[in-house]
């Protein structure tokens, strides 16, 4: 294993709250600028497990707007365009990090928070429980 | 209408880097404690657009481990268990926030970064381009 040496140019860490409280530069670096714009633009409509987009907005959080997927049907869309209830539309969930203002309404103090979001839906074969 | 007053208990903001650099409490509050642990554990295998999970590890990032979905097939699995190439398995992508150590190897100094991750796959009807 590699033990990375500490950079001598690091900010002072003698703060009584260290290492729980750290300095974070909020000038976000976006690594996605050159991605293919056609990426996943309308999958929510074209999927066999289509979903609607719910807007979750909170001014005390960054990002302040998070899009949540809500599966449109319990079943999946078949080749005829009908809902097939022998299959299930299920949300694909992911834990994401957000910044929560703490104390509330403070412009320069935050706490990391983990929240679970539904990103989209997928069609799965159901688990069938056989009753004895 | 409400204009939220600044909390008088906010940390000092006279820092020369303010407001770009802020204090963040890394003692993560997890809002997901009551979620069903079986959530989407095996959807990657049961989906009609199954995926594999690849481990993306970076010690200079928090979280240091991110799981990336890679669709197993170009097409989708049909009722017979075969790959149907008239449909497409596509990744559902999401932008997430991570913390990047800056300067590198510093334990208490970070920069916010947005990265794009594939969370899972869904089965979509292809877009057919007709050539005149």
């Amino acid at each position: 294993g590699i033990t990375i040496p500490r950079n001598p140019g690091c900010p002072n860490s003698e703060d009584k709250n260290f290492p729980r409280t750290v300095m974070v530069n909020l000038n976000i670096h976006n690594r996605n600028t050159n991605t293919n714009p056609k990426r996943s633009s309308d999958y929510y409509n074209r999927s066999t497990s289509p979903w609607n987009l719910h807007r979750n907005e909170d001014p005390e959080r960054y990002p302040s707007v998070i899009w949540e997927a809500k599966c449109r049907h319990l079943g999946c869309i078949n080749a005829d365009g009908n809902v097939d209830y022998h299959m299930n539309s299920v949300p694909i969930q992911q834990e994401i990090l957000v910044l929560r203002r703490e104390p509330p309404h403070c412009p320069n103090s935050f706490r990391l928070e983990k929240i679970l979001v539904s990103v989209g839906c997928t069609c799965v074969t159901p688990i069938v429980h056989h009753v004895a | 209408g409400i204009t939220i007053p600044r909390n008088p208990g906010c940390p000092n903001s006279e820092d020369k880097n303010f407001p770009r650099t802020v204090m963040v409490n890394l003692n993560i509050h997890n809002r997901n404690t009551n979620t069903n642990p079986k959530r989407s554990s095996d959807y990657y295998n049961r989906s009609t657009s199954p995926w594999n999970l690849h481990r993306n590890e970076d010690p200079e990032r928090y979280p240091s481990v991110i799981w990336e979905a890679k669709c197993r097939h170009l097409g989708c699995i049909n009722a017979d268990g075969n790959v149907d190439y008239h449909m497409n398995s596509v990744p559902i992508q999401q932008e997430i926030l991570v913390l990047r150590r800056e300067p590198p190897h510093c334990p208490n100094s970070f920069r916010l970064e947005k990265i794009l991750v594939s969370v899972g796959c869904t089965c979509v009807t292809p877009i057919v381009h007709h050539v005149a």
Partner: antibody, heavy 129, light 110 residues
Amino acid sequence: EVQLLESGGGLVQPGGSLRLSCAASGFTFSLYDMLWVRQAPGKGLEWVSSISSSGGVTMYADSVKGRFTISRDNSKNTLYLQMNSLRAEDTAVYYCTTDPGNYYDSSGYGWLGPGVNLWGQGTLVTVSS
Amino acid sequence: QSALTQPPSASGTPGQRVTISCSGSSSNIGSNTVNWYQQLPGTAPKLLIYSNNQRPSGVPDRFSGSKSGTSAPLAISGLQSEDEADYYCAVWDDSLNGWVFGGGTKLTVL
């Protein structure tokens, strides 16, 4: 200066095409969801299309679905609206605007201030024979 | 016809309090936050209220928004001549996967 500037409007015949552009400056464009909103002469505001900050999700009003395409180039700080199969009822002033929910506390963060919502000056599209 | 219903016009005298209604449904106002825009003649719209009741900096506290169920009124107290404009409510609609605007209310200061 923080601003949005639309261009590309003009007179076009029914069935024709136009491409609108919206150049952003003075803020971190790649962090914002963007919208196109239009206003027909003497009428109210109508949402046309939205695109997420990365360009990964696009949404359209039913009235333009299949005819209009929204896109963005974050490296050029520019939002686009490709309009095909134009109809007389598409005649309107077209505005680009930031999502009103992408607010934050100080422009020094690289984000806009609380509730700061940018609108361009608008570009007029006239569809007529 | 708009998914959000606003009265086409409203009026008041200087100093008066005026309320503009905006009613929708469970898929829009009932489940999402409401924004209000002011559009002065010949200009682009301006955000007046966001997240139901928040005022952007620079917007006078005479303007206030609220939300209850599927309706979200805008109140303007101490009416002034410069408030004469068109006012629009807007909200995301979960069912339509899109933004919906009210038809707009023309406010006249008598």
